[in-house]
């Protein structure tokens, strides 16, 4: 309980730059006072801070920076040299990944079966963090440029590009404006919208003979 | 529906070996650093261990060291604790557990729990 | 290790109650709190993560605060599904610790 990481920030984008720090409080009472705090990315080589000062209360601080974050999730150790080994300190997760892209292709078909529109999209590239895609909506006129009442959002579940909207939050034969939002930690993005009447998208089932 | 289910546990006599599994679903398995978890009947919590999204890097309690071994297979959702040398102190609760990211650790999804009971 | 010490360990309340429940760790460990729901044979919740932050799902009633050493999770006006056990974690320092707990019971 001597030791403590901070990250900065400790979610970032792949490829970007991560700075941490190692304190060591003054009261611990296992370790010398000129102690060297060390390093440690995942497996790889353990490696000394790019500097290591003492603040006023007797702390003693390291200090990195990660040029490259080149994992999409990864533990950082702060270690000090124990014996003929090494003592942890702490660990701190890191997590990197990328925005999501504007979810593309997006179309809906009214399905009368189960009353409902059913809409679908595809997601864009991986992103490597948990990403949310909503399927947003109001209702409008013809060409969608008005925004009229707001249908409740539709939540998309984990690793489905689809979401359907119930027959009684539609207005059959009235336009309403449909997009895809996708969000992240790392920002959002949105769809292009899709203008349309839920009856000009019926999904006709074949006849039953 | 986001979950974690464990299984495994039972009644084994000290010096013996259990290996728990813990199936996820609802979730990107492979984006989430997993830990273990233990409470024994009656009493709080304590950490056991934990492995990043790889396999690569596996941490343990002192309690356990030497002993447990964490692993996990990403195809198969599926996190796993070998447990060899059982004592009667190791008898608890044993949860997987995933960590919010962007938070330190907090857990926002819990198995239900898989009993560990060591007893001759 | 950062010792965590709740208190009360036990507390008998009414529903409707406003409820507190204290943590202490050992030493300073900033924001680096977060804390937990047990109901009896269940898995814990998540309720309230860097000591002030209120997981997503869970009441606006239960609320988090403090920083350091001293933490409280508040509970504004106990509900019948609040009478449980309650965790606090520390996530500051290796290994991360929890609290004995402190058991919410009907008066």
């Known amino acids: 309980s001597c030791g403590h990481i901070e990250i900065s920030p400790p979610v970032v984008r792949l490829g970007d730059p991560v700075l941490a720090s190692c304190t060591i409080s003054p009261n611990c009472s296992k370790l010398d006072q000129q102690a060297k705090i060390l390093w440690r990315l995942q497996d790889e080589p353990i490696q000394p801070g790019d500097r290591q000062h003492h603040l006023p209360d007797g702390t003693q601080e390291s200090l990195i920076t990660l040029p490259h974050l080149n994992y999409t999730q990864a533990f950082l150790f702060c270690l000090v040299p124990w014996e003929d080994s090494v003592q942890l300190l702490d660990q701190a997760e890191l997590h990197a990944g990328y925005p999501p892209a504007s979810p593309s292709n997006l179309s809906c078909l009214m399905h009368l079966t189960t009353n409902s529109l059913v809409c679908q999209w595809e997601p864009g590239p991986e992103t490597h963090l948990p990403t949310s895609f909503i399927l947003k909506s109001f209702r409008s006129r013809a060409d969608c440029q008005y925004q009229g009442d707001t249908i409740p959002d539709c939540v998309a579940k984990k690793r489905q590009n689809n979401c359907s909207i119930p027959r009684k939050n539609l207005l059959l034969y009235q336009y309403m404006a449909i997009w895809v939002q996708a969000e992240n930690m790392l920002g959002s993005s949105e769809s292009p919208k899709l203008c349309l009447d839920p009856m000009d998208v019926v999904k006709l089932e074949p006849p039953m003979l | 529906e986001v979950q974690l289910l464990e299984s495994g546990g039972g009644l084994v006599q000290p010096g013996g070996s259990l290996r728990l599994s813990c199936a996820a679903s609802?979730?990107?398995?492979?984006?989430?650093a997993m830990w273990w978890v233990r409470q024994a009947p009656g009493k709080g919590l304590e950490w056991v261990s934990l492995i990043d999204v790889s396999g690569g890097v596996q941490l343990y309690a002192d309690s356990v060291k030497g002993r447990f071994t964490i692993s996990r297979d990403n195809s198969k959702n599926t996190l796993y604790l070998q447990m060899n040398s059982l004592r009667a102190e190791d008898t608890a609760v044993y949860y997987c557990?995933?960590?919010?990211?962007?938070?330190?650790?907090?857990?926002?999804?819990w198995g239900q729990g898989t009993m560990v009971t060591v007893s001759s | 290790d950062i010792q965590m010490t709740q208190s009360p360990s036990s507390l008998s309340a009414s529903v409707g109650d406003r409820v507190t429940i204290t943590c202490r760790a050992s030493q300073s460990i900033s924001s680096y709190l977060n804390w937990y729901q047990q109901k009896p044979g269940k898995a814990p919740k998540l309720l309230i993560y860097?000591?002030?932050s209120l997981q997503s799902g869970v009441p606006s009633r239960f609320s988090g605060s403090g920083s350091g050493t001293d933490f409280t999770l508040t509970i504004s006006s106990l509900q019948p599904e609040d009478f449980a056990t309650y965790y606090c974690q520390q996530s500051y320092s290796t290994p991360r610790t929890f609290g004995q707990g402190t058991k919410v019971e009907i008066k």
């Open positions: 860097a000591a002030s």
């Open positions: 609802g979730f990107t398995f492979s984006y989430y």
């Open positions: 557990a995933k960590p919010l990211i962007g938070t330190r650790d907090a857990f926002d999804i």
